[in-house]
């Protein structure tokens, strides 16, 4: 057992048929001595009397708030949670496996640029009686500061029969330098619960593998006289790191229909402006990504051809 | 300790073009590596992240682009001497602050190459033959070094008299890749500034 | 499975015409471009021009520009490349090709000689 | 136009060896390069397109790299059935121009 927040505990079980549980001691935070009871959530039966309690957890029906009276005044409580652990593995029921970029990813994050500001985000199908608090740091060992907003719901989505909700959070390094090189990962640690079950999801990466810049900006269109081709030409995103000299990007442009299967024209440039075939009917789209260091692409920025 | 942004004339920086393979043949060498060492711990999750030059060389710092200099998390108290005849911008305004970033950078390269060149003697022993260093990727190192043109003591390669440990070998490998790409990127960001400037 | 059967080989006299034909089986004939290349004996390739079966839309390399004519027909699914006053150096097979994306080329014919001689 | 130009004209490899080809352009073309292999009385055959990308169907051991003005066709360990004319071709800009073509040849 360890104690998440004040008053709030959680008890890490083995989870299996007929498992023994854990055999936990409640004190009640009292100078009293004697005359104390103690009762579990709403219920008004006592379970036992006296300054501790001593208690066998071995299912949810065990876990909850426990409050220790005297003579019908509230001396204080304590909220237990449970941390299932089935053949070995903490359970992950709370949060839903996004298998991008890889099976039993829960958290996802990604950053606009390099100053040590990212956005993390996780799916559930849980609507009420759900809180999360999230920490993060730089390192482990000799952990150097990351601080994080709160969590909130960010988006909510009709998945089939069910619904999906998507919670977010910001974060920011202390003392970030767009330019260093990092040599230890952030971690970001996403405790949530629901109802009396308590998880906990972790995710370690470094900022410039999760770079994934905004789309470019200003897209604009100059047909060129006596021919087919259209010079396209755009701006890097306002939410990219400065000097652009230093951190460059290199772009991909593209004149699609709006069919994913139809034919297209696509060039890749280092520049801000390119010359390519538009035809009737089709967009010209352009995406962004670091130059030298290739993680995501950004998301496209589009404008007719017409 | 940064860059002034008064510098070169267009086209007389023939770095860049070299920092550009640079970063290329790393890469190469890199996914090489982690494709022919999928049974070892090379991918960036597994490794740990070690820097060689972590206090003999601060390019990071000497290299700053001038716009960064305001930012207090950027500059580092750390003080290295450095070799300030460089000749790669072909140019007579190669200021003092440059030529400190481009002696930093050349310092990197030769505690990388001789480190390289050690760790190939060692896997050309390896009875599985399952590794070489990529000569292309030597050869360009050497390109860039030629290219800034910086007078140093010559390091000498490390020989090593015991019977090589190649699964550490492997793995020492995977490390120094992972690590000099990351320089690499440092680099060709740096020579990108210094051309655009 | 896309398939590209062009017409057979030709033999010209200098100063005259040659009209190649490329037909397209498999998939839809206007969901993709036509290229037009040729290789003389023993050279390597030169691309000559592309055109848009859906809108007849064409871009030709200015070295063939006001000589050749590249064409298309719906209906039958086919392409036509036509050079004029041929002279002896357009000896060569001509290939037509297929493609979805525009600037690269993924389905080739098989070829068609076209030898210009007196 | 964009000239490309690559290297060696004539590859001689040992059956089992690595074989690179190098591939250079006049003007900085991004990865707006791609690769063809051709057999003597055949069409060309695509094997790499944006300089890096592998293509369906075509053996692992075919891999190119580059981006700039420099880039590499690398084939790890030549098969009886490699030995042919590559092609290099650019697509940053009409006209579209290919390489000279590098005969690899059987050692």
């Known amino acids: 057992i360890w104690e998440l927040k004040k008053d709030v505990y959680v008890v890490e079980l083995d989870w299996y048929p007929d498992a023994p549980g854990e055999m936990v001691v409640l004190t009640c935070d009292t100078p009293e001595e004697d005359g104390i009871t103690w009762t579990l959530d709403q219920s008004s039966e006592v379970l036992g009397s006296g300054k501790t309690l001593t208690i066998q957890v071995k299912e949810f029906g065990d876990a909850g708030q426990y409050t220790c009276h005297k003579g019908g005044e509230v001396l204080s409580h304590s909220l237990l949670l449970l941390h299932k652990k089935e053949d070995g593995i903490w359970s992950t029921d709370i949060l839903k496996d996004q298998k991008e970029p890889k099976n039993k990813t829960f958290l996802r994050c990604e950053a606009k640029n390099y100053s040590g500001r990212f956005t993390c985000w996780w799916l559930t199908t849980i609507s009420t009686d759900l809180t999360f608090s999230v920490k993060s740091s730089r390192g482990s060992s000799d952990p150097q500061g990351v601080t994080c907003g709160a969590a909130t719901l960010s988006a909510e989505r009709v998945r089939g029969d069910n619904k999906e909700y998507e919670y977010s959070v910001e974060c920011q390094e202390d003392s970030a330098c767009p330019a260093a090189e990092e040599s230890l990962p952030i971690e970001v640690m996403v405790d949530a619960v629901h109802k009396l079950k308590y998880e906990n999801y972790t995710s370690s990466f470094f900022i410039r593998d999760i770079i994934k810049p905004d789309p470019p900006k200003n897209l604009q269109l100059k047909p060129l006289k006596n021919s087919r081709q259209v010079e396209v030409s755009w701006e890097y995103p306002d939410t990219w790191s400065t000097p652009h000299s230093y951190f460059s990007l290199t772009f991909c442009v593209q004149v699609q229909g709006k069919s994913k299967r139809e034919k297209k024209d696509r060039v890749f440039t280092d520049k801000t402006s390119a010359t390519v075939i538009c035809r009737k009917n089709a967009s010209i789209s352009v995406r962004a990504q670091d130059r030298y260091y290739s993680s995501s692409w950004s998301e496209w920025a589009s404008v007719p051809c017409s | 300790r940064n860059l002034p942004v008064a510098t070169p004339d267009p086209g007389m920086f023939p770095c860049l073009h070299h920092s550009q393979n640079l970063l290329r043949a790393v890469s190469n060498m890199l996914q090489k590596a982690r494709q022919t060492l999928e049974f070892y711990p090379c991918t960036s999750e597994e490794i740990d992240h070690e820097d060689i030059t972590k206090d003999k060389t601060s390019t990071v710092e000497a290299c700053l682009p001038l716009e960064l200099t305001k930012n207090e998390s950027c500059l580092n108290s750390r003080e290295t001497s450095f070799i300030t005849n460089g000749s790669c911008l072909a140019s007579r305004k190669t200021s003092f602050m440059m030529a400190l970033c481009l002696s930093s950078i050349y310092e990197d390269l030769k505690m990388y190459q001789v480190e390289f060149k050690t760790m190939n003697a060692k896997l050309l022993m390896d009875p599985k033959r399952q590794i070489f260093l990529d000569q292309n990727m030597l050869a360009v190192i050497d390109e860039l070094m030629q290219a800034l043109n910086f007078n140093s003591e010559t390091v000498p390669q490390k020989s090593s008299l015991e019977e090589p440990d190649f699964y550490k070998t492997k793995i020492k490998l995977c490390i120094l890749l992972h690590a000099f790409r990351i320089r690499a990127v440092t680099i060709d960001r740096v020579m990108s500034y210094l051309n655009a400037s | 499975q896309v398939q590209l059967v062009q017409s057979g080989a030709e033999v010209k006299k200098p100063g005259s015409s040659v009209k190649v034909s490329c037909k397209a089986s498999g998939g839809t004939f206007s969901d993709y471009y036509l290229h037009w290349s040729r290789q003389a004996p023993g050279q390597g390739l030169e691309w000559m021009g592309w055109i848009d079966p859906e809108n007849q839309d064409t871009e030709y390399a200015p070295k063939f520009q006001g000589r050749v004519t590249i064409t298309a027909d719906e209906s039958t699914s086919t392409a036509y490349m036509e050079l004029s006053s041929l002279r002896s150096e357009d000896t060569a097979v001509y290939y037509c090709?297929?493609?979805?994306?525009?600037?690269?080329?993924?389905?080739w014919g098989q070829g068609t000689l076209v030898t210009v001689s007196s | 136009d964009i000239v490309m130009t690559q290297s060696p004209l004539s590859l001689p490899v040992t059956p089992g060896e690595p074989a690179s080809i190098s591939c250079r352009s006049s003007?900085?073309?991004?990865?707006?390069l791609h690769w063809y292999q051709q057999k003597p009385g055949q069409a060309p055959r695509q094997l790499i397109a944006f300089a890096s990308q592998s293509i369906s169907g075509v053996p692992s051991r075919f891999s190119g790299s580059g981006s700039g003005t420099d880039f590499t066709l690398t084939i790890s360990s030549l098969q009886p059935e490699d030995f042919a004319t590559y092609y290099c071709q650019q697509s940053n800009s009409f006209p579209l121009t290919f390489g000279q073509g590098t005969k690899v040849e059987i050692k």
């Open positions: 003007d900085s073309i991004s990865i707006n």
């Open positions: 090709a297929r493609t979805k994306e525009l600037r690269y080329i993924d389905v």
